[in-house]
């Protein structure tokens, strides 16, 4: 008895397609050996038609596929345009050779069934319309017309001219003549069903001198769409539904059973278990629009519908289109904690996954919103300035070539918990949801700096420090000059003096910044911040103001004085946390975005976008840098 | 919601054959757009795969077989009546049981065997085959 299974018989139709699944035990070999499907001969041998590793035979060019999926232990073949010629004796097997593991399947093609000589054949999907052509002679222009449906023994009444409609059809169906013409006369049949399908009469006129045309309605169920995504990444739906339902809602639901359950729509409707992962964007005025979901799981897998209906809803008749959604376990996405706590007035270093293929795409990160339809304004990126709410408290870090780039923000308050993406204008599947938690602080924060009131005065010396605790010893201290384009890491000391100065005192546990003379372009935000090698970890921010030895020493509000130099990123990078959970992030990964749906995702103006290098801080100091000196404390 | 309700079992001699009816009820949508089958469970062991038919559309069926039955099945459908059928020839005593009607929504990607996948089950028709 064959460990491997499958149908033993399948059955169809010239010109239809097949797919047939076969199933293999759940071992490492069989999941990764060669998969096969071959054609029995007479003589016993069985000839190779295609396998898993390339091989396509030459009647099946163009036709066929073969596909496995090692997280089902199953292979599918697929095979298009089937002719009688295809009917016979075949095996799906696994193995080197052809005769491996396998299992028989019959498969038989039957001629398309005879109608009778004059049907005219209409071909449907679910949902549209159709509108049925019924040619009749002169004299029969006065007598009435009719549409009626073939059933086992008679024909029922579909519509006559006399304006008797049968009751499944009120509302659906209409009939007509067009101008002047005497000779022909229209049934008009709208928001088609399977039940629609079958065999219909039109007729003019009564007894032996009547016309009468045969048609033959044929109504598809729209073909499923398989889509194949890996774990943690994302996929599109992108619906196309016709101008006729531009103005309906529109909705994307997941088949259950009996029903198909809504997962969104255009009314605000939003399955729980995709809260933060989920986008509905309408395309255009024709009925076009687009589901984006992210952080794909294994649970997402099935059987996927979308569709227009007033209420939102899956509804008899309406137009429909269909996925099978298969979702590989073996996903070259990373595995990464999707869900960051912080603490309030803390911060988090979340590190977003990209295609390490892919380094000098622009990286981004946008704030998910459900309200509406839903949508990701983009809150920065390498070539996009920081929004005007998150100023002083939000950059990114990115360093090519590392698959990671890391987005840091601090000054956390409870408004900041949600959801927020990762995403690039790359590889498109690498889109990474991450959820933030805020949870009100219980303690002293682990980085505090001095003095809190900072007004620096115009030519004179002035130092800030960060405190420390010890478990931070070991770790690398930063200090950097936030602008709307990044965080700028100032020089260590051995980088030259007359710079922007960094220096530790092992027994007070504080690193010092100071500003000698202080100039104008020294006022806005600084971070200090520690790190481990590349990964980023804990940073607290301090405005310092600068001010004119004649005046006072009043605040200078952040948001007014914030200079807004177009300092570039260090290119730094982080990827995993440091020191204590709750303050540290990892991301859940996913996948990435083309610029258009970037634009999309982000709603973001252009003038967001700037179009200066983000990725070297080189040729980018600071004019006042060469002011400054470095102290040791 | 589907209702399926079975007939045709009996008492039958070993060798004889016996042909099952499930007829399904209740389902908005249409009868093609389901896999239907059969499982079995005879006395103290385990409810086993017997048959399941695979609608792909109006034309493209596909049957399934437990192989410790295979050559003594038919699968079919009548889909005006709703109805599947199981012809089962040479019965032997070990395919005494009670035989389950089963449908699922499911579509074709899952594993016909795996009776988890199923959604809907009938109350069962007991077939017994006397040596």
């Known amino acids: 008895k064959s460990p491997i299974f499958g149908p033993q018989e399948v059955s169809s139709i010239e010109g239809d397609s097949v797919s047939i699944t076969c199933y293999y035990p759940d071992t490492s070999v069989n999941r990764h050996t060669r998969k096969y499907w071959c054609r029995q001969g007479a003589s016993g041998m069985c000839t190779t038609l295609i396998s898993s590793n390339g091989y396509l035979s030459k009647e099946y060019s163009g036709r066929a596929n073969l596909i496995n999926f090692p997280e089902n232990n199953t292979f599918v073949i697929n095979i298009e345009q089937l002719t009688q010629d295809d009917t016979g004796s075949y095996k799906c097997g696994l193995g080197t050779s052809n005769r491996g593991l396998s299992f028989d399947v019959s498969l038989e093609v039957s001629q398309v069934p005879e109608l009778p000589s004059d049907t005219h054949v209409y071909t449907k999907d679910i949902g549209r319309n159709v509108t049925i052509e019924c040619p009749f002679k002169r004299e029969n222009a006065p007598s009435k017309k009719s549409l009626c449906k073939k059933t086992n023994q008679s024909c029922e009444l579909v519509i006559d001219s006399t304006e008797k409609v049968n009751p499944s059809y009120i509302g659906r169906a209409k009939l007509f003549m067009k101008g002047t013409d005497l000779t022909v006369f229209y049934v008009n049949i709208s928001h088609l069903t399977h039940n629609d399908a079958g065999l219909y009469i039109c007729q003019a006129g009564e007894g032996p001198s009547a016309d009468k045309k045969n048609v033959d309605l044929q109504v598809l169920a729209p073909e499923p769409e398989l889509l194949y995504k890996d774990l943690r990444s994302s996929v599109t739906f992108e619906c196309d539904l016709g101008r006729e339902v531009a103005n309906e809602a529109k909705y994307l639901c997941r088949m259950n059973k009996e029903t198909c359950d809504v997962i969104i729509n255009t009314l605000g409707k939003r399955d729980p278990d995709f809260e933060g992962r989920i986008l509905i964007t309408p395309k255009d005025d024709n009925g076009r629009f687009s589901v984006l979901i992210t952080g794909l799981r294994k649970e997402d897998a099935g059987h996927y519908q979308c569709g227009a209906h007033s209420s939102g809803l899956p509804q008899e008749g309406w137009p429909i289109q269909t996925w099978q959604l298969f979702v590989n376990e073996e996903s070259t996405i990373p595995n990464r904690r999707s869900v960051v706590k912080g603490v309030t007035g803390g911060s988090v270093a979340i590190a977003c996954p990209y295609n390490p293929k892919e380094s000098s795409s622009l990286k981004y990160w946008c704030r998910w919103e459900g309200d509406g339809n839903g949508h990701c304004p983009v809150l920065v990126g390498t070539q996009a300035q920081v929004q005007e709410e998150y100023e002083g408290r939000l950059a990114l870090f990115d360093q090519p070539g590392n698959g990671t780039y890391t987005v840091i923000l601090n000054q956390l308050t409870t408004e900041d918990a949600g959801f927020y993406w990762c995403l690039t204008n790359g590889d498109s599947r690498w889109r990474t949801t991450i959820e933030l938690q805020v949870a009100e602080a219980t303690r002293e924060p682990n980085l505090e700096v001095t003095p809190q009131n900072a007004t620096a005065v115009l030519g004179e010396t002035f130092t800030v420090s960060c405190h420390y605790p010890c478990k931070f010893y070991s770790q690398e201290k930063y200090w950097c000059k936030w602008s709307n384009k990044g965080c700028h890491i100032l020089p260590s000391h051995d980088e030259g003096a007359r710079q922007s100065s960094v220096s530790c005192d092992q027994s007070s546990q504080l690193v010092s910044m100071t500003l000698n003379p202080v100039s104008k372009e020294d006022e806005g935000w600084y971070w200090c911040g520690v790190k481990q090698g590349q990964t980023y970890g804990e940073t607290t921010a301090i405005y310092i103001a600068v001010e004119e030895r004649t005046r006072g020493s009043s605040h200078v509000n952040p948001t007014d004085a914030n200079a807004r130099a177009k300092v570039a990123l260090e290119e730094e990078v982080v990827d995993s946390s440091i020191s204590e959970k709750e303050n540290k992030a990892i991301p859940n990964p996913g996948p990435f975005a083309n610029e258009r749906e970037i634009q999309n995702v982000g709603d973001q103006a252009q003038e967001n976008r700037a179009s200066g290098d983000a990725g070297s801080a080189d040729g980018q100091s600071r004019s006042s840098s060469s002011k400054h000196h470095h102290h040791h404390h | 919601e589907v209702q399926l309700v079975e007939s045709g079992g009996g008492l039958v001699q070993a060798g004889g054959s016996l042909r099952l009816s499930c007829a399904a009820s209740g389902s908005g949508r249409t009868f093609t757009s389901y896999t239907m089958g059969w499982f079995r469970q005879a006395p103290g062991k385990e409810r086993e795969f017997v048959s399941a038919l695979t609608w792909a559309d109006d034309s493209t069926y596909y049957k399934y077989y437990a192989d410790s039955m295979k050559g003594r099945l038919t699968i079919s459908r009548d889909n005006a009546k709703n109805t599947v059928y199981l012809q089962m020839n040479s019965l032997k005593p070990e395919d005494t049981a009670v035989y389950y009607c089963?449908?699922?929504?499911?579509?074709?990607?899952?594993?016909?065997?795996?009776?988890?996948?199923?959604?809907?089950w009938g109350q069962g028709t007991q077939v017994t085959v006397s040596s």
């Open positions: 089963v449908a699922t929504g499911r579509g074709l990607t899952y594993d016909p065997r795996d009776r988890r996948k199923y959604d809907y």
